[in-house]
């Protein structure tokens, strides 16, 4: 009933199109703050006004829900950040076509379980991809290049769409600490026609199986079963899951007693969700009420800020969000091994991001 997620999806679609269908810059707006100045800022303001109108229209059915308030505050922040006027033109909503490309091009039918090949045949270009990651405290890098440190405890959905469900379960890093770390990851690859049976992957600290819950290492006996596979280069510390049928690669790592999650996923897949599907940290970032600012860190153990900075600087020479996350984690946990989580997350981003200009994010606080 509360259709705020439809507003979110339409906003994301309209901002993606500002950069020619690429996956970059969606919520950052692509530079240039002022009205009409910078890349796509006029378009971004139009998209934001449309988003504001859409959320206003959901107020009757969503006003008591977190997703609604997160959207309202997010729009407010972005309109101020990009110097958008309240009045002015709005962007038309994007056409609501099928999420995944189908046949019908007159060419021989492409492999239905090869998303990239199928998309390229249909559209004459490769698909756009999005990247999301969760590591350390946890820090979440959303599809739209928001970077948040979350105080979330318990189970929270990173992704919840028509094809994938990813849930992270977090608990406090240390007694009395605001910060939490991910101890368990659950990933559900939903049943898909001739490609795969539903498969569940579950990882916990000190238990990173190189198999799905049913013991299999692929998508099952269907013709496209091999389009889902699981492998490792470092047993016990690293698992990579390839889901070619939805253009997706997932990496799970264990470092310093916590789990990291990283995904590269086709845009259409990531955005294939309905109003019934709840908040997703990869889509909206951390809800405002669950965000920790860097000022909230409470140091534990003997590591000083200078030592933490020096340890992090070794593997993260650029003082970006990954560097600051590393410092945060090392200070709070007192464990130098937390540097590895941030370094690995940066390397995954380097491999997964379609636009390397967006690799280094710089925190505003």
């Amino acid at each position: 009933q509360c259709k705020i997620l439809r507003c979110n999806a339409e906003y994301v679609s309209s901002t993606l199109s500002l950069r020619g269908g690429g996956s970059s810059g969606a919520l950052r707006g692509g530079g240039g703050g002022g009205r009409g100045g910078g890349v796509g800022s006029g378009g971004l303001c139009r998209a934001l006004r449309s988003y504001a109108l859409c959320t206003r229209r959901t107020a009757r059915t969503c006003r008591g829900d977190l997703a609604f308030h997160s959207a309202v505050h997010g729009i407010e922040d972005l309109m101020i950040q990009h110097n958008c006027s309240r009045q002015g033109p709005t962007a038309p909503p994007p056409p609501r076509g099928p999420a995944l490309p189908g046949a019908g091009s007159g060419l021989p039918a492409p492999d239905p379980c090869d998303y990239e090949g199928r998309f390229s045949r249909l559209h004459g270009r490769p698909p756009g991809f999005l990247h999301c990651a969760s590591f350390g405290d946890p820090h979440v890098r959303s599809f739209h290049h928001h970077f948040h440190t979350c105080r979330v405890q318990g189970a929270w959905p990173l992704l919840d769409n028509d094809f994938l469900f990813v849930q992270a379960t977090s608990s406090p890093m240390a007694l009395g600490a605001n910060a939490t770390a991910t101890r368990k990851l659950t990933i559900i690859f939903k049943n898909m026609q001739e490609c795969i049976d539903q498969k569940v992957y579950q990882a916990e600290v000190d238990n990173l199986p190189v198999a799905f819950e049913d013991g299999s290492i692929n998508g099952g006996d269907r013709p496209g079963g091999s389009s889902l596979s699981i492998q490792t280069a470092n047993p016990g510390n690293h698992v990579e899951i390839q889901a070619a049928y939805i253009g997706t690669t997932i990496i799970i790592r264990q470092t310093a007693g916590q789990l990291s999650f990283s995904i590269k996923v086709a845009e259409d897949v990531a955005m294939a969700f309905s109003a019934e599907q709840d908040l997703q940290l990869c889509v909206g970032g951390c809800p405002p009420s669950q965000r920790l600012s860097r000022s909230e860190r409470n140091r534990r153990g003997a590591i000083t800020i200078d030592t933490a900075r020096r340890l992090c600087k070794e593997g993260l020479p650029v003082e970006d969000a990954y560097f600051h996350s590393c410092v945060f984690d090392v200070l709070i946990s007192g464990d130098p091994n937390f540097t590895v989580a941030a370094q690995a997350a940066l390397e995954d981003a380097r491999a997964f991001l379609p636009d390397l200009e967006k690799l280094h994010l710089f925190p505003s606080d």
């Epitope: 509360c2 008591g64 829900d65 977190l66």
Partner: antibody, heavy 115, light 112 residues
Amino acid sequence: EVQLVESGGGLVQPGGSLRLSCAASGFTFSNYGMNWIRQAPGKGLEWIGMIYYDSSEKHYADSVKGRFTISRDNSKNTLYLQMNSLRAEDTAVYYCAKGTTPDYWGQGTMVTVSS
Amino acid sequence: DVVLTQSPLSLPVTLGQPASISCRSSQSLETSDGDTFLEWFQQRPGQSPRLLIYEVSNRFSGVPDRFSGSGSGTDFTLKISRVEAEDVGVYYCFQVTHDPVTFGQGTKLEIK
């Protein structure tokens, strides 16, 4: 699967108080506004009130304003309805329901106000 | 407060036949943005209410397609294309456009 289980109903004298609870599971409770709705025996449905996800706002029907208070404990995934100065006309099955506008409902708990 | 008036209050129907319930509002339920927040609930005997239709005509997840909603402004209709035994119960319309939200008085559907 969304589940809402109300408890705390029973027999109470006019002027008395009662506190109902609604235990939620199967969804992220702290993300949603919640409602209380009641149904007198053999009658229709009457909305009592709702509370925002973070308790920042509460809205009540005129018939219960000043007597009933809705609260929630997100750490316990529980919604509450504190009912004071109860009257015979408050006799009903009380339902909690998920969302700013109710989509999923509990099975209800019976409150009887009688001397 | 907005008053929702349902008719008929009692509706005997033969299995397999269509059924139609009307809900009239004392004022328009259309917002200035053109949205109409009218919903329909079903309450089977001894059970709690279940959402069938939201925003006039959208079926909630898991609701069979024999249920449909229509209408605008002040006049709304819930239709069941072919009544089945499990459809027996009371049907309520519910408006969310104006505060306080209000229910209709209910229509009891029974099998002839």
